[in-house]
């Protein structure tokens, strides 16, 4: 941290490594919950026009796709991977791509992904051909 910048106690707004280098925050699509037309596709764009600076540098990008009898929604947010989201752990938070994984939720089809490259939750991927070993 630069010497002229105050250090504050219990500050989670800044993340530093052992050398004092500072981590920049993630840039994520952040439209909260919106109705979506994304259905039966290998991948979809979020159609979210808001790219926000995540509040805390440890936060990653998250997308949640939900389908029930009435509608389809897509949620885009920043979230701390140390904390559950919709009661699920963000196990893929280090991934550069947002690869959707189905989660068990009664009464709806529920997919969620997380990722840690800029605006990575703008392109959500459902296709099985993408996986964590894919270098792209």
């Amino acid at each position: 941290i630069p010497p002229h910048v105050q250090k504050s106690v219990n500050n989670d707004m800044i993340v530093t490594d052992n050398n004092g280098a500072v981590k920049f925050p993630q840039l994520c699509k952040f439209c909260d919950v919106r109705f979506s037309t994304c259905d039966n596709q290998k991948s979809c764009m979020s159609n979210c026009s808001i790219t926000s600076i995540c509040e805390k540098p440890q936060e990653v990008c998250v997308a949640v796709w939900r389908k029930n009898d009435e509608n389809i929604t897509l949620e885009t947010v920043c979230h701390d991977p140390k904390l559950p989201y919709h009661d699920f752990i963000l196990e893929d938070a280090a991934s550069p791509k947002c690869i959707m994984k189905e989660k068990k939720k009664p009464g709806e089809t529920f997919f969620m992904c997380s990722c840690s490259s800029d605006e990575c939750n703008d392109n959500i991927i459902f296709s099985e051909e993408y996986n964590t070993s894919n270098p792209d």
Epitope: I1, P2, P3, D17, N19, A21, K23, F24, I53, D118
Partner: nanobody, 124 residues
Framework: EVQLLESGGGLVQPGGSLRLSCAAS???????RMWWVRQAPGKGLEWVS?????????YYARSVMGRFTISRDNSKNTLYLQMNSLRAEDTAVYYC?????????????????WGQGTLVTVSS
């Protein structure tokens, strides 16, 4: 020597406006994403806004979206922050900083160079 020099801070009433400037020298300005970061008294850093080196894509924290506008003039090596509809909670020291796009961490403990900051006080 790399230098970032902020200016334009001051005392302003709630609802008022200010324009901050950051004059950059000693590095290739057009290679860096530039940031405005602020620190309120006794609080942590808040990442306010960023702008890409080319194409001028901009990003904002949700707390300032719609009120603040970041811009840059690459011909003058200068970064700006237009702050409108100021609130008491915007009171802080405002710093500019530079980031190599895509790099997650700064190169060193000085945030890959910061300015010294300019104080903005919003009070009636």
């Amino acid at each position: 020597e790399v230098q970032l020099l902020e200016s334009g801070g001051g005392l302003v009433q709630p609802g008022g406006s200010l324009r901050l400037s950051c004059a950059a020298s000693g590095f290739t300005f057009t290679e860096y994403r530039m940031w405005w970061v602020r620190q309120a008294p006794g609080k942590g850093l808040e990442w306010v806004s960023a702008i890409e080196p080319i194409g001028n894509r901009t990003y904002y924290a949700r707390s300032v979206m719609g009120r603040f506008t970041i811009s840059r003039d690459n011909s003058k090596n200068t970064l700006y922050l237009q702050m409108n509809s100021l609130r008491a909670e915007d009171t802080a020291v405002y710093y500019c900083a530079k980031q190599i796009p895509g790099r997650k961490w700064t190169a060193n403990s000085r945030f890959d160079y910061w300015g010294q900051g300019t104080l903005v006080t919003v009070s009636s």
